[in-house]
Interface confidence: medium
């Protein structure tokens, strides 16, 4: 599923991401935009043999199990395919674990490069939340 901007903002708010660990909703929507272009089925392969999955491009070396990533830790204890569902529950729950891990949203390269320090509130402006 490819979410609309405000549709995703509402879904993320429903799942408790607004101000989760101090990160406003705009940060999460911005991250999703530049990680996956709001596409729940996005997959991208990395040079280390891992793959990033879903709307927040969660990595198979650390966070989920795709059955084929050497040394996978599967810290979210889920199959990576669950992160590709049109229901973002699994992605949100795993993202909560990631953002609590010490580096905050710096774990997402796209957030670090494209969202951090910008007017992220623009990503939820005009949305009925």
């Amino acid at each position: 599923k490819v979410f609309g901007r405000c549709e995703l903002a509402a879904a993320m708010k429903r799942h408790g991401l607004d101000n989760y660990r101090g990160y406003s909703l705009g940060n999460w929507v911005c991250a999703a935009k530049f990680e996956s272009n709001f596409n729940t089925q996005a997959t991208n392969r990395n040079t280390d043999g891992s793959t990033d999955y879903g709307i927040l491009q969660i990595n198979s070396r650390w966070w989920c199990n795709d059955g084929r990533t050497p040394g996978s830790r599967n810290l979210c204890n889920i199959p990576c395919s669950a992160l590709l569902s049109s229901d973002i529950t699994a992605s949100v729950n795993c993202a909560k674990k990631i953002v609590s891990d010490g580096n905050g949203m710096n774990a997402w390269v796209a957030w670090r490069n494209r969202c951090k320090g910008t007017d992220v509130q623009a990503w939820i402006r005009g949305c009925r939340l």
């Epitope: 089925q41 996005a42 997959t43 392969r45 040079t47 043999g49 795709d66 059955g67 084929r68 990533t69 050497p70 199959p79 990576c80 395919s81 590709l84």
Partner: antibody, heavy 115, light 107 residues
């Protein structure tokens, strides 16, 4: 137990297209990548590419882009590979395998003859 | 692409001999190297994953070693059922690649 059952041998004319199937049983089909491998005598094994049935995400070996197209039907737990514009170079045995990084589970192979 | 070179291309042995098959990668692949056996008109069979991890049901005479670019499959006291083709495969990066194979034949 995990099984991958491929479709039967095919004899095709040059220029035609063929669609090979791979039916998976014994595991959650949407969760694992299905990989396709080509084997020609004297050419060893070649990785064609892969599909994640749950999302339809595909990756192709550059060498096979434009030649192979992967699809999957999650209602029947079947993956498909279509090969187009067939030439004698496409004559080979084609395997599907479950993509675990390594390949423990293989189909029995589909022999394609182009002549 | 990572190239895997297997040697020798053919190995002629007598049952009871011990043999070593080599697989060399064109760049470091850590331990992401797997070994297969294939007999005529059969699908490949996974013997060893990640350089040295034997699969269940595989006889203990098969073992693997190496890291980086140089890998070895050893067969301690070859039995008649072991004759066939052996392939290595890397999963360190895409595209996945296979070695050209070593044919183990009866002398």
């Amino acid at each position: 137990q995990v099984q991958l059952q491929e479709s039967g041998a095919e004899v095709m004319k040059p220029g035609a297209s063929v669609k090979i199937s791979c039916k998976a049983t014994g595991y959650t089909f949407t969760t694992y990548w299905i990989e396709w491998v080509k084997q020609r005598p004297g050419h060893g094994l070649e990785w064609i590419g892969e599909i994640l049935p749950g999302s339809g995400s595909t990756y192709y070996n550059e060498k096979f882009k434009g030649k192979a197209t992967f699809t999957a039907d999650t209602s029947s737990n079947t993956a498909y590979m279509q090969l187009s514009s067939l030439t004698s170079e496409d004559s080979a045995v084609y395997y599907c395998a479950r993509g675990d990084g390594w390949y423990y589970y293989w189909g029995q192979g589909t022999t394609l003859t182009v002549s | 692409d990572i190239e895997l070179t297997q040697s020798p291309a053919t190995l002629s042995v007598t049952p009871g001999d011990s043999v070593s098959l080599s697989c060399r990668a064109s760049q470091s692949i850590s331990n992401n190297l797997h070994w297969y056996q294939q007999k005529s008109h059969e699908s490949p069979r996974l013997l060893i994953k990640y350089t040295s991890q034997s699969m269940s049901g595989i006889p203990s005479r098969f073992s693997g070693s190496g890291s980086g670019t140089d890998f070895t499959l050893s067969i301690n006291s070859v039995e008649t059922e072991d004759f066939g083709m052996y392939f290595c495969q890397q999963s360190n990066s895409w595209p996945r690649t296979f070695g050209g194979g070593t044919k183990l034949e009866i002398k």
